[in-house]
């Protein structure tokens, strides 16, 4: 059975968008009529890993490109970066460890916790225009919440 | 936590429409990637997997029983249900709903044992 | 579909033993595997997962190898809680089950 996916966009809890920065970061920032073709659309694969109770395991690459996001260690730090992978073999179910993140859906509310990285959350600054990161706290400065729109195919 | 039960009569007669009712709690069936399954064992036999639905209602069948079989959700009750029409002795069995986040079953419950016999 | 062979159907064992359990699958299904364990009147428990992978909470006595077709359960130092029967499934295609290894007290 073939991984199966759905195509969406992101947006914090403050409503910011995620658009490419550079070739190998994302940013957030608020983005409002034809700027919102500028967001990234995601591919989020629905891969096997540890279940629990609301949390679904999940790859994120990005739409039609060879970059998914991985968790990796950088000077001792998790860290959120954007890797290329080979198209050929990517999505696949048993996706290596540092791409998985569990989705933790309550109240049409996502966050996204590394499978590598537990307690490390994707997350987004307060202020404008800086980059989507690897945050270890919840509930304090950084937005760990997210929405998520779905893009027809 | 995660918990489901299986309910449905316990004595069904040939040719009878049989239908099972999976209640869960502990997620919801609204959540992308989430999925439940059918699963029987006759008594003393393996376990055969039936049919699955998806949170975006997307289903499947096992090939050969497929012809008799229709998966649905209430996604408000969480409750999923499974028809199979015209059943035979043979369709005796203890029948299981597990959440499948696609691949493997973590989570079962404790099934429901239903006898066909006239 | 793909078919799932199981060895042996039966096994005797004493406690503290090690255990191996295969099953083969009718075709390659690469990693896409998992083994079950289930007590009478019970509903299977799953154990492992990708063919070796270890579910939360289950003892580090499991193990699962293998790939393509051939693939093995082991239990390296049986325990009393450990009797009972063994199901392995594979999810490459529509899911398919063994028919079961039980593994009774010697």
């Known amino acids: 059975a073939p991984v199966r996916s759905l195509n969406c966009t992101l947006r914090d809890s403050q409503q910011k968008s995620l658009v490419m920065s550079g070739p190998y970061e994302l940013k957030a920032l608020h983005l409002q009529g034809q700027d919102m073709e500028q967001q990234v659309v995601f591919s989020m694969s629905f891969v096997q890993g540890e279940e629990s109770n609301d949390k679904i395991p999940v790859a994120l690459g990005l739409k039609e490109k060879n970059l998914y996001l991985s968790c990796v260690l950088k000077d001792d730090k998790p860290t959120l970066q954007l890797e290329s992978v080979d198209p050929k073999n990517y999505p696949k179910k048993k996706m290596e460890k540092r791409f998985v993140f569990n989705k933790i859906e309550i109240n049409n509310k996502l966050e996204f916790e590394s499978a590598q990285f537990p307690n490390w959350y994707i997350s987004t600054s307060q202020a404008e225009n800086m980059p989507v990161f690897l945050g270890g706290t919840k509930g304090g400065q950084d937005i760990t919440d997210f929405t998520m729109q779905f893009v027809s195919s | 936590q995660v918990t489901l039960k299986e309910s449905g009569p316990a004595l069904v007669k040939p040719t009878q429409t049989l239908t099972l009712t999976c209640t869960f709690s502990g997620f919801s069936l609204s959540t992308s990637g989430m999925g439940v399954s059918w699963i029987r064992q006759p008594p003393g036999k393996a376990l055969e997997w039936l049919a699955l639905i998806y949170w975006d209602d997307d289903k499947r069948y096992s090939p050969s029983l497929k012809s008799r079989l229709t998966i649905s959700k209430d996604t408000s009750k969480n409750q999923v249900v499974l028809t199979i029409t015209n059943v035979d002795p043979v369709d005796t069995a203890t029948y299981y709903c597990?959440?499948?986040?696609?691949?493997?079953?973590?989570?079962w419950g404790q099934g429901t044992l239903v006898s066909v016999s006239a | 579909d793909i078919q799932m062979t199981q060895s042996p159907s039966s096994l005797s064992a004493s406690v503290g033993d090690r255990v191996t359990i295969t099953c083969r699958a009718s075709q390659d299904v690469d990693t896409d595997l998992a083994w079950y364990q289930q007590k009478p009147g019970k509903a299977p428990k799953l154990l492992i997962y990708?063919?070796?992978t270890l579910q939360s909470g289950v003892p580090s006595r499991f193990s699962g190898s293998g790939s393509g077709t051939d693939f093995t359960l082991t239990i390296s130092s049986l325990q009393p809680e450990d009797f009972a029967t063994y199901y392995c499934q594979q999810y490459s295609s529509y899911p398919t089950f063994g028919a079961g290894t039980k593994l009774e007290l010697k």
């Open positions: 990708w063919a070796s």
């Open positions: 597990a959440r499948s986040a696609y691949y493997s079953f973590a989570y």
